[in-house]
Interface confidence: low
């Protein structure tokens, strides 16, 4: 019989008392085969973290700073359940730390030196740890003691709770450094008042502070937020302009064997029976003998943290950077305006080989990081382990939802000013063998399908989006008799046609022979009835253009396109017979790396782009014998995006809507994790 006990860690007598009450009340409402609570008492949160790591306890609820400690080796804990605030319909699990300024003050984030600052309090998250952590490497040396470095960075501050004797500059803007509401500039509202009164130039608070203090929108309009990319935005746009997104209060557990499903089952049942306004005799979110015992008193319920989400992703790149800077206190030798090498994310073995060759040729401008799937690469870019990669539109959507931005677009047509003219896109098509003359768009049910990969544009999002509108369900593996859609569940009929061996079968990378455009076409040639690819795929792999044994004798005339009106047309008539226009592949990165990735890639394509005529003796960035490694092989150049610099603008409203509709069918664990952080 599996042990269904969750050992909750309590950090005080009062918490232990509430935990026992929690245990007893859960016993009275949950059947004997359901989850149960046991209580473990420790002296501090850090002791609880160690106890969970050592398998002496299973769960504890922590503030963001402690979630970071819990994640660090050797603890290796992960977030499993989040408390939420506000309503069930619009649950708030995060708040945003922001830098608020007056509208006409005319400076940016990188010009804060010498300004006057308003803080909620020394050592507090939004008011001190996050802004000072992010500014850490800009502080004058020596950076220890930290308060002295901050005092020398700003021309005056109000930082309640600071030592006014040792660091008078930190209390210069407020009447003393009082650490309570008696100090009119203490806390969120106080720090904002310090700005509003004109004492300071910038206030470090949380996003809701300005709404709580200014009911009138016309008044709020006189303030702006400083963004990390050295721009400003209106205060409403805090989701796109903040210093960090911070989880409020989170249950953590072991990463391996951590009982996360059991913990969720327990807490979900607990909130049903003892949540807000549920029970008189025991309340989960109430602390008669103290404050915030086990859970925050202000919490309204729990949400399950998506399993794909580790602590780094949950806390977010900015927060982790800020806290790491404060804790470790390490900075690059001397801050320079020079760009650091761009860490390119390479998928599996083949891409890594090409990337290493690029790295050598780039003389230190490009470094390589490996991952097994596109989603793993996106996650690495999010958390700073990698910086950039080129993605199909479907993954640009996921990357965008995860906070990444497109920076350059692949262009596939030769033109005089290729780099200045991003193209409208390519065509997603459905290809069949000419010999299968009875096959049309309207009778695909029960046929064998070939897809580039799940989540990709031409191979999945467009055809499956159109199909979804017809069949109104997500059971595509029932619709087709079998197929190869790399990235599907291994036991799905959509992995049955795939050719990868062993663990590589149906993997969404080049170890699966039927992966990508060329792979999907090969799947059609050898096994399938229909392939969903781009309009250039057939000509690129027929007429001897692909020397591989399976392709070298293929003839374009032996294939036809399925049109949405139920007719068929020759391959060259793709402009009048396609499923939809697809956005070109694009390079994505983090916002903070945008300028450097742009600069370095433009240099690299001038050195190794399509102007290199002999690829046998020289490194060519856009060539890989039809395998589309790192970039599509038909890329002519990487083009500037001009104002299409967000994933929505880049992909276009129609495509974003199509993928949005298909999200009901999404199996993307990363998308689930990212929409948890930003619904």
């Amino acid at each position: 019989v599996p042990d269904k006990t969750v050992r909750w860690c309590a950090v005080s007598e009062h918490e232990a008392t509430k935990c026992q009450s929690f245990r007893d009340h859960m016993k009275s409402v949950i059947p004997s085969d359901g989850p149960s609570v046991a209580c473990v008492k420790k002296a501090s949160y850090l002791d609880c973290i160690r106890a969970i790591a050592a398998n002496e306890a299973d769960a504890v609820t922590l503030d963001a700073g402690l979630v970071y400690d819990a994640y660090l080796a050797p603890n290796n804990l992960k977030p499993v359940v989040a408390e939420f605030y506000g309503s069930k319909e619009d649950p708030q699990t995060f708040y945003y730390a922001v830098a608020v300024v007056k509208k006409d003050s005319g400076f940016q984030m990188n010009q804060l030196r010498g300004k006057k600052s308003c803080h909620t309090g020394l050592g507090r998250s939004a008011g001190w740890n996050i802004p000072i952590g992010l500014l850490y490497c800009d502080l004058p040396e020596p950076r220890k003691p930290l308060e002295k470095a901050v005092a020398n960075f700003f021309s005056g501050s109000c930082a309640p709770c600071a030592d006014g004797t040792d660091f008078p500059q930190l209390c210069q803007l407020c009447p003393g450094c009082g650490c309570s509401t008696l100090n009119q500039y203490f806390g969120y509202s106080g720090a904002f008042k310090c700005l509003k009164d004109g004492a300071g130039d910038v206030a470090f608070v949380k996003h809701s502070t300005i709404f709580e203090n200014l009911a009138n929108k016309a008044d709020r309009d006189q303030y702006e937020l400083l963004c990390l990319d050295n721009t400003r935005k209106p205060v409403d746009e805090y989701k796109d302009c903040h210093l960090a997104q911070v989880p409020s209060h989170t249950v953590v557990a072991r990463s391996m064997g951590g009982k996360e499903d059991l913990i969720w089952e327990l807490l979900n049942q607990a909130q049903e029976h003892f949540g807000k306004d549920k029970s008189k005799e025991f309340q989960l979110f109430s602390s008669p003998h103290g404050k915030d015992l086990l859970f925050k008193d202000s919490a309204h319920g729990f949400l399950k943290v998506p399993p794909r989400m580790d602590a780094k992703m949950y806390l977010g790149y900015e927060y982790v950077t800020a806290i790491r800077n404060l804790r470790e206190g390490t900075c690059p030798e001397a801050p320079t305006d020079e760009c650091k090498p761009v860490k390119w994310c390479a998928l599996s073995h083949h891409e890594r080989l090409k990337c290493d060759e690029w790295s050598v040729n780039s003389v230190g401008k490009i470094e390589c990081v490996s991952a097994e799937t596109t989603e793993d690469c996106i996650a690495k870019i999010m958390n700073g382990e990698a910086d950039a990669m080129s993605l199909d539109g479907g993954f640009v959507y996921i990357a965008g939802k995860c906070g990444l931005v497109p920076v350059l677009a692949e262009n596939y047509n030769k033109s005089d000013n290729c780099e200045d003219t991003p193209e409208a896109g390519y065509f997603a098509i459905a290809v069949v063998k000419k010999s299968a003359s009875d096959l049309t768009w309207d009778n695909l049910k029960g046929k064998k399908s070939c897809h580039t990969a799940v989540g990709r544009t031409a191979g999945w999002n467009i055809p499956m989006g159109l199909l979804y509108n017809k069949i109104n369900h997500c059971r595509f593996d029932e619709f087709f008799s079998e197929g190869c859609a790399p990235g599907s569940k291994k036991d799905s009929s959509l992995c049955k046609l795939c050719m990868g061996s062993g663990l590589n079968l149906c993997e969404p990378n080049n170890k699966e022979g039927y992966y990508g455009y060329t792979g999907a076409f090969r799947c059609l040639v050898e096994k399938g009835d229909v392939a969903f690819v781009k309009h250039q795929t057939v000509p690129q792999n027929t007429g001897g253009k692909n020397p591989d044994p399976w392709a070298k004798n293929l003839n374009e005339k032996d294939y036809e396109l399925l049109c949405l009106d139920g007719t068929r047309k020759p391959v060259e008539e793709y402009a009048n017979c396609h499923l939809a226009r697809a956005p070109n592949h694009a390079v994505v990165t983090r916002k903070d790396k945008e300028a450097c990735v742009h600069k370095i890639l433009r240099q690299q394509q001038h050195l190794f782009g399509s102007n290199v005529t002999d690829c046998s003796g020289n490194f060519c960035l856009f060539r890989s014998e039809t395998k589309d490694l790192l970039f599509r092989d038909d890329t002519v150049c990487l083009a500037k995006l001009h104002d299409r610099n967000t994933y929505e603008k880049y992909l276009g409203e129609e495509y974003v809507k199509a993928v949005g509709n298909l999200r009901k069918c999404s199996t993307s664990s990363l998308l689930e994790a990212c929409t948890f952080r930003r619904p």
């Epitope: 506000g86 809701s208 709404f211 009138n216 929108k217 016309a218 309009d221 209106p234 409403d236």
Partner: antibody, heavy 120, light 113 residues
């Protein structure tokens, strides 16, 4: 295209509560902007009632604050008006509308309005 | 609350004529920091909801024909229709969003002779 559509009862008795729904299509009410209720009396006078911001923050006209509230259901992309203890003076056409970030309170999208009569 | 007085309350003109209507505010709607006037104009055709024409006193909303012009500053504002068309038959309202709560004028009804 952003569209707003009001719905609710045509007739309400005095002292009862009035509940109206605004259903928004083409834009998520949590993604940005403020979402307002405005009414127009039979003699054509327009009166602003209040808004709910995409963040969930609300703001009401001082003259109605005590008996008026706005809530929302983000899963259905709807926001609601509740006006308690209605009198015949509350007979009007009720509109929902959206404003821009810039300028605030200048309503760029309106519903077609729903007419409510308060009468016994 | 800020009061807005519109005049005339109604006027009748022939197609092709120029029309001017005014909106007076009980206090200045000019915000000195950004030099913007927090005033909007709306058009309401019979049986329809109001439609935003002008904001910041003089900025035309996209899609609004250029025969509609907003002008003025501080407390006195004007909406001009340079050459009236039959479809302009409407009530025109001004609205201030300088100060909470936002308020509307009582409207000017434009009739076609």
């Amino acid at each position: 295209e952003v569209q707003l559509q009001e719905s609710g009862p045509d007739l309400v008795k005095p002292s009862q509560s009035l509940s109206l729904t605004c259903t928004v299509t083409g834009y998520s009410i949590t993604s940005g902007y403020s979402w307002h209720w405005i009414r127009q009396f039979p003699e054509n006078k327009l009166e602003w009632l209040g808004y709910i911001h995409s963040s969930g923050a609300t703001n009401y006209s001082p003259s109605l604050k005590s008996r008026f509230s706005i809530t929302r259901d983000t899963s259905k992309n709807q926001f609601f008006l509740q006006l308690n203890s209605v009198t015949t003076e509350d007979t009007a056409t009720y509109y929902c509308a959206r404003d821009g970030y810039s300028p605030p309170y200048a309503m760029d999208y309106w519903g077609q309005g729903t007419t409510v009569t308060v009468s016994s | 609350d800020i009061e807005l007085t519109q005049s005339p309350s109604s006027l009748a003109v022939s197609v092709g004529e120029k029309v001017t209507m005014t909106c007076k505010s009980s206090q200045s709607l000019l915000y000195s920091t950004n030099q913007k006037n927090y005033l909007a104009w709306y058009q309401q055709k019979p049986g329809q909801s109001p439609k935003l024409l002008i904001y910041w006193a003089s900025t035309r909303e996209s899609g609004v024909p250029d025969r509609f012009t907003g002008s003025g500053s501080g407390t006195d504002f004007t909406l001009t229709i340079s050459s009236v068309k039959a479809e302009d038959l409407s009530v025109y309202y001004c609205q201030q969003y300088y100060s909470y709560p936002p308020t509307f004028g009582s409207g000017t009804k434009l009739e076609i002779k």
